[in-house]
Interface confidence: medium
């Protein structure tokens, strides 16, 4: 049988705080446990969750859990039942409410001698008791023709008079807490002789030259007094009116018109009533003179066809407060749709090519119009007009590859080379339209080319391939004076490219054929060994079909080579004696002959008195000193070739004899001593 | 002396293919670009494909573009075309022909008759 | 593409005469790529001239070309019997190679 060991107890429970009702089961076999309110299953929420067999409230709420409590164990195998007691909760709770006139029905009613009753909505349990104040200060039972009754939570004015004027609260008391009364009551009973306020007189806001008019009116009795100022205190009547106001018009219910209103009629208006007892009452009103200011500008837009997007319409300032609307092609946009007005944005939702064009947002108020365009563009992904061609250019010339696309916007167009980035340079120019120029083609040009077109919406892109038609030119062109050397072998090289490879052959400028030990090999003119007679002019032929011929003059001279009869050796000389560096070349054309000291040539002209140079190629140095030491180079050349030889110079210091070293002893180096 | 022999003509159906050969001799054929060119009849001369010397830049005319293919083989002193999806206005005389755009030695042709 | 175009279509002259042959180009390109042929009935085409007036090997010196820009010419000084033919221009300096539609001279 289901026991139950604890059941649920009936209880105090306070509004939002935590309760639990315990239950716990004891059964020869598994149960499982739920709880009825009223006859219903209670669900778990984050509030009322059952806990164990228990049932947890996180925040006891007055409403929902008022009612009965029952705990529910079954055997799901044996099918048997077992409740537990009911339990309920004794909530207590108080709740604050506003202060309201029970008594006239309404404000308007409520006249001076006439009974006036407030009611203080607080509620609670257990009941709460009330206590009420004017304006801050409790106010007693049966204290100054007033009553409070608790059970009606009522206070009664009767009558009421002006001293019963205040603002009016509650606050209510119970075991569970205390609320005061969240919203109060001003009771307003005045004296007759008051002035009182019939009309207020609004801001009003009018563009300039036009009207403006402020209506204020007081009621007493005696009727009340009213008079007009403005900013500075100064009356207005109609008959002193201040000079900035000679428009001004005083009507007899004290209705003040403006009219031509300037910007100095512009700022704070008073109207002030005066009843036979009580103070004045100051009514203000401001006069706005009506202003639009300029719209900024906007910066053209670009979107991509499929896409939403916004523009939004900042207004200019303005007085009152521009509205602002949008336009297209004249026509107000709605404020639904595909294209349409939201607030002060244009919206475009799954834009189309159509939609491109100007917009137009307009603002508006009393003081004008204002405008501003903006130009929107829908972009397109581009597409060909001309893709680039494999193409054969000729070397030298300059060479074209079109890469012609439409989109909107233009699309902008990009050439890359091997991969890589053409950057436009002295070589490479690329056209407004996309044309590539390669102004000067060259053989290394023969390349794949890309081009690719963009737009925001995407890109397009394509290849090419250029084949470089070599232009016939001489590779390398043959040296147009060059030397042989006499009686040996000498080959002068001729080699040329072309579209196609061209055939080389060598002949004699004067038309003469080549002699037998002459040969020419594929464009390389062979001298077996060379004569005298060998020297003279020579032109190589390149000629292939299509570029016909071109021809490479070559001067051949015959030489001798440069040879030294006598080289300079290494020399040692004691400074302020003179050296000699001694030579000699030979060969044909005869050498002449050049010396470098310290590393720069030794210019015969500007030699000065210590140095010369004699007719057989010899240096001399006289009255020589420690800074002449270094290298020296003798080069011999002539107009066939160029040699050199070079030695040392040392400069020493005269050395004394010592006693020991007899005077024939020989320096340990070769010296010359003058 | 330059000899260019073309074979390999013949009637073929529209949506057919026909391989054209053409055999060089009397000169270095590794050194020169070579062409086809062809001759409808009674019409003007009409360039088909060029190919350089080592095979590595390839041109067609726009109206073939795709559909034939020319390669060479310089080990054999040869040049082929290979016509797919032959059409009726594909009927010509097929040269083969010598030089870099300009023909200096052309063989005697062969004919190819598109015709159901 | 650049085109060529020929004129006249056909030239009916008699043996000795003045043979002139117009070919104009859609757009300007090097002279040193104007070829002339000259085809007789059921053969292969023949080179005469290149470079717009260097003659081929083994052609007689009565042909004779010139020009340059875009307007060609092709001269034959006196008309043999043989050069009743056929001729072509073309142009070799740009891809697609191009030819002329052809001038036929016949025998008046």
């Known amino acids: 049988a289901i026991v139950f060991i604890k059941q649920p107890s009936s209880q105090d429970a306070l509004q939002g705080r935590r309760a639990l009702l315990r239950c716990e089961v004891e059964a020869p076999g598994p149960v499982h446990v739920y709880w009825l309110l009223d006859g219903a299953p209670v669900q778990d929420t984050e509030r009322r969750f059952a806990q164990g067999s228990s049932l947890s409230f996180a925040a006891v709420d007055r409403l929902q859990d008022s009612g009965t409590f029952q705990c529910v164990a079954r055997d799901d195998v044996t099918g048997e039942e077992a409740r537990s007691a009911n339990a309920s909760f004794n909530i207590k709770w108080i709740e604050a409410g506003p202060v309201v006139l029970k008594h006239p029905a309404s404000e308007a009613e409520i006249q001076p001698q006439t009974q006036v009753t407030l009611r203080c909505h607080i509620d609670g349990h257990p009941r709460p008791t009330y206590q009420w104040f004017r304006d801050g200060t409790p106010l007693s039972d049966g204290q100054s023709n007033h009553t409070v009754s608790s059970k009606e939570r009522n206070l009664t004015l009767r009558p009421a008079g002006p001293e019963h004027s205040g603002l009016y609260s509650c606050c209510a008391h119970s075991a569970f807490g205390q609320a005061c009364s969240s919203q109060n009551f001003t009771l307003s009973i005045a004296d007759e002789s008051f002035a009182r306020v019939v009309l207020a007189p609004q801001d009003v806001v009018v563009a300039r030259y036009e009207e403006a008019m402020f209506h204020c009116q007081f009621s007493a009795q005696p009727p009340p007094s009213l008079q007009w100022l403005f900013e500075d205190e100064t009356p207005i009547t109609n008959r002193s009116r201040p000079p900035h106001l000679r428009r001004a018009t005083v009507f007899a219910n004290g209705s003040l018109l403006l009219t031509q209103v300037r910007p100095r009629n512009a700022g704070i208006y008073r109207c002030i009533g005066q009843g036979q007892r009580g103070p004045p009452i100051i009514l203000e009103a401001t006069l706005h003179l009506a202003e639009i200011e300029d719209m900024p500008l906007f910066e053209p837009r670009v979107f991509t066809a499929g896409s939403e997007e916004r523009v939004t319409c900042l207004p200019p300032k303005g007085l009152p407060e521009p509205s602002v609307w949008w336009e297209h092609a004249g026509v107000r946009l709605p404020t639904h749709g595909r294209v349409y007005q939201k607030g002060h944005e244009l919206v475009l939702a799954n834009i189309a090519e159509s939609d491109a064009g100007v917009y137009t947002c307009h603002a508006a108020n009393l003081a004008g119009q204002r405008r501003q365009d903006v130009n929107i563009t829908v972009a397109t992904v581009p597409s060909w007009l001309k893709k680039p061609q494999d193409s054969q250019l000729e070397e030298g010339k300059p060479g074209y590859l079109d890469c012609l696309t439409q989109a909107t916007p233009k699309p902008t167009v990009v050439w890359y080379r091997n991969q890589m980035l053409i950057s436009e340079d002295s070589r490479f120019e690329v056209f407004k339209n996309g044309t590539l120029r390669i102004n000067s083609v060259e053989v290394y040009d023969g390349t794949w080319y890309r081009c690719m077109s963009s737009t925001p919406a995407g890109s397009i892109e394509a290849q090419a391939r250029v084949q470089v038609l070599e232009k016939l030119k001489f590779t390398p062109p043959p040296q147009p004076q060059q030397c042989m050397e006499f009686d040996k072998e000498a080959t002068v090289p001729c080699s040329a490219t072309g579209r196609e490879k061209p055939t080389i052959k060598w002949e004699r400028a004067d038309g003469s054929s080549l002699p037998e030990w002459v040969t020419d090999n594929a464009g390389t003119l062979h001298f077996a060994r060379v004569t005298r007679d060998d020297a003279g002019n020579y032109t190589c032929i390149a000629s292939n079909g299509p570029q016909g011929q071109i021809r490479a003059h070559v001067q051949l001279t015959v030489a001798v080579f440069i040879t030294f009869k006598v080289e300079p050796e290494r020399t040692t000389v004691y400074q302020g004696h003179t050296a000699l560096l001694q030579c000699e070349a030979q060969g044909d054309p005869k050498p002449l002959i050049q010396w470098k000291g310290k590393d720069r040539i030794l210019d015969p002209t500007k030699l000065g008195p210590r140095m010369h140079i004699f007719q057989n190629g010899s240096l001399v140095i006289h009255d020589v000193a420690p800074e002449d030491s270094g290298r020296y180079t003798c080069i011999a050349g002539n107009s066939c070739n160029i040699k050199h030889t070079e030695a040392p110079l040392y400069v020493v210091d005269k050395p004394v004899p010592e006693e020991s070293e007899g005077p024939g002893s020989p320096p340990p180096y070769k010296m010359i001593q003058t | 002396e330059v000899q260019l022999v073309e074979s390999g003509g013949g009637l073929v159906k529209p949506g057919g293919s026909l391989r054209l050969s053409c055999a060089a001799s009397?000169?270095?054929?590794?050194?020169?670009?070579m062409n086809w060119v062809r001759q409808a009849p009674g019409k003007g001369l009409e360039w088909v494909s060029s190919?350089?010397?080592?095979?590595?830049?390839?041109y067609y005319a726009d109206s073939v573009k795709g559909r034939f293919t020319i390669s060479r083989d310089n080990a054999k002193n040869s040049l082929y075309l290979q016509m797919n999806s032959l059409r009726a206005e594909d009927t010509a005389v097929y040269y083969c022909?010598?030089?870099?755009?300009?023909?200096?030695?052309w063989g005697q042709g062969t004919l190819v008759t598109v015709s159901s | 593409e650049i085109v060529l175009t020929q004129s006249p279509g056909t030239l009916s002259l008699s043996p000795g005469e003045r043979a002139t042959l117009s070919c104009r180009a859609s757009?300007?390109?090097?002279?040193?790529?104007l070829a002339w042929y000259q085809q007789k009935p059921g053969q292969a085409p023949r080179l005469l001239i290149y470079?717009?007036?260097s003659r081929a090997t083994g052609i007689p010196d009565r042909f004779s070309g010139s020009g340059s820009g875009t307007d060609f010419t092709l001269t034959i000084s006196r008309l043999e019997p043989e050069d009743f033919a056929v001729y072509y221009c073309?142009?070799?300096?740009?891809?697609?190679?191009?030819f002329g539609q052809g001038t036929k001279v016949e025998i008046k």
């Open positions: 022909a010598r030089g870099t755009g300009l023909f200096d030695f």
């Open positions: 190919i350089d010397s080592s095979s590595s830049f390839i």
């Open positions: 073309q142009q070799y300096g740009r891809t697609p190679w191009t």
């Open positions: 009397g000169f270095t054929f590794s050194s020169y670009s």
């Open positions: 757009q300007s390109f090097s002279s040193s790529y």
């Open positions: 470079g717009a007036s």
